[in-house]
Interface confidence: low
Amino acid sequence: AGVFELQIHSFGPGPGPGAPRSPCSARGPCRLFFRVCLKPGLSEEAAESPCALGAALSARGPVYTEQPEAPAPDLPLPNGLLQVPFRDAWPGTFSLIIETWREELGDQIGGPAWSLLARVTRRRRLAAGGPWARDIQRAGAWELRFSYRARCELPAVGTACTRLCRPRSAPSRCGPGLRPCAPLEDECEAPPVCRAGCSLEHGFCEQPGECRCLEGWTGPLCMVPVSTSSCLGLRGPSSTTTGCLVPGPGPCDGNPCANGGSCSETPGSFECTCPRGFYGLRCEVSGVTCADGPCFNGGLCVGGADPDSAYICHCPPGFQGSNCEKRVDRCSLQPCRNGGLCLDLGHALRCRCRAGFAGPRCEHDLDDCAGRACANGGTCVEGGGAHRCSCALGFGGRNCRERADPCAARPCAHGGRCYAHFSGLVCACAPGYMGARCEFPVHPDGVSALPAAPPGLRPGDPQR
């Protein structure tokens, strides 16, 4: 057993004319992710043949937005290694397929916008435990730089990870019953490797892959305590002097879940949480691979072709669950603004906007004065995507429905007296000033007349 590791160093336009400027389509920002597929041998294999040695998918990279007129740089990449665990021997000769995928982030109709941007295939010879191999590959107009290696996972060692050894604990001996692992004198043969997950505390094995339980423990991984027989009576506290709890005939007694499934009690029954690759009420159904199409709703399946090996479904937005089978209620995040109604169509979110609003999330206030009532003689004024009412004198508020005192703003200059009137306001100017707002001083040789207040006006306080 071991792990194949791939490190992507860079992905971007290759040298020469005709290089693409952006990996994103015209629809907006996108991000990249990578898929690696390993096939044994050097033979020409069909692209559809299974990734028999395993496959892995990277995380999504940072969002990339095209910069107009700028040359396309190396694109932002996801962090970390791509790791492909292999369970059996490392074959030494293999085919390495690296795919670069693009995920478009705009609102999509018809499913997640995933598209294959580039694929490189290399046939390689590689010994496990060796140094990182470096490579540069071109796929169309794109260039990919990467390194890779295969390493064994202890206790496996060797160029094919087939010998089970462990480092010697002392210079002179390996431990009771364990011989040095030839031809490497500083390694020792390992004891049998127990079944994966076998309890270190309550289980042991004499043959690789088995899990035998110590007394008092049961279950496929020796993690379930056997009901004690010293307590008699009903489920719950015993009436005996020992005062112990009697598990009684609980639904999870003896762990009914096969294949390493864990049991949890439900009212009157039990539920098994199965490891990946196993299904059924008791995790008894196995042998599901990517070839069976277990990923739904556009989920991307990654995993070995071996029926016993696990697969992983990478779900598109809006879906979750080990098989992308659960539809996420994305409307619970209330993405629609301004009172819009959210519709989760599975493949996309849609907002049904209230009248006067538009945009993917109802974020644009469209009210273009068409349906806007500015009361009391007000006029609607548009500008910058917004709108407002310009109210007639004497009125204010969003719709000009509120009465306003035209004299409140003290419009009469130089101590003029303000009078409110249905048609507006009138300024009675102080001596020496004239004009509609008393803004002009009277020339020394001129005569200024103080107009009488028109009938029906109420005098306001003189302005200070």
Epitope: F319, G321, S322, K326, G346
Partner: antibody
Framework: QVQLVQSGAEVKKPGASVKVSCKAS????????ITWVRQAPGQGLEWMGD?????????NYNEKFKSRVTMTRDTSTSTVYMELSSLRSEDTAVYYC??????????????WGQGTLVTVSS | EIVLTQSPATLSLSPGERATLSCRAS??????LHWYQQKPGQAPRLLIK???QSISGIPARFSGSGSGTDFTLTISSLEPEDFAVYYC?????????FGGGTKLEIK
């Protein structure tokens, strides 16, 4: 080839429950949603809900039936069940199971069972 | 819920003629519309999915068109076995709903 085989006709009294089975074969059972549709005599089709066999707790029910319908599955026998409780005379119908074809999160039904007639009569 | 209205309720035509069946949705359902054929005593059969996508094993004389709220199923030249009831179905939002059906009968 893909086949969905349903259980036989049932006659029930009002207030009782009925459990209709739908056995799938010819494809990977856990990989497709199964939907239930009913058809009253001389009437159109009515969607009741669906279940994802890969995870038995993953179901969608029509609000109209939500309080009375339960969909379950048994992966060991590749069988889906639809149980309808508190039966009334208007539940008399042919009940169909159908396999959903998954495309982009919306579902058409490409394979159908032969139907199970449930008669509710006192 | 989305209501699908099919028209006409009954269509009387002769073999060899062209049939046009209509399905109108109460609100936009994008392209999430499918057509089924049902004969007496049989389960429905999927004819067209997602407005116009053909189904393996369905004769090429069946075709679909439309978008948004108005959709059409066309049978270019009727064969005797085409006389049946036709249903449209939307899978745009819950609950999934069917139209009331159009009965295509021999004239």
């Amino acid at each position: 080839q893909v086949q969905l085989v349903q259980s036989g006709a049932e006659v029930k009294k009002p207030g009782a429950s009925v459990k209709v089975s739908c056995k799938a074969s010819g494809y990977t059972f856990i990989s497709y949603w199964i939907t239930w549709v009913r058809q009253a005599p001389g009437q159109g089709l009515e969607w009741m809900g669906d279940i994802y066999p890969g995870s038995g707790s993953t179901t969608n029910y029509n609000e109209k039936f939500k309080s009375r319908v339960t969909m379950t599955r048994d992966t060991s026998t590749s069988t889906v069940y639809m149980e309808l409780s508190s039966l009334r005379s208007e539940d008399t119908a042919v009940y169909y199971c159908a396999r959903e074809t998954t495309v982009g999160g919306a579902y058409a039904m490409d394979y159908w069972g032969q139907g199970t007639l449930v008669t509710v009569s006192s | 819920e989305i209501v699908l209205t099919q028209s006409p309720a009954t269509l009387s035509l002769s073999p060899g003629e062209r049939a046009t069946l209509s399905c109108r949705a109460s609100q936009s359902i994008n392209n999430n519309l499918h057509w089924y054929q049902q004969k007496p005593g049989q389960a429905p059969r999927l004819l067209i999915k997602y407005v116009s996508q053909s189904i393996s094993g369905i004769p090429a004389r069946f075709s679909g068109s439309g978008s948004g709220t108005d959709f059409t199923l066309t049978i270019s030249s009727l064969e005797p076995e085409d006389f049946a009831v036709y249903y449209c179905q939307q899978t745009n939002s819950w609950p999934l709903t069917f139209g009331g059906g159009t009965k295509l009968e021999i004239k």
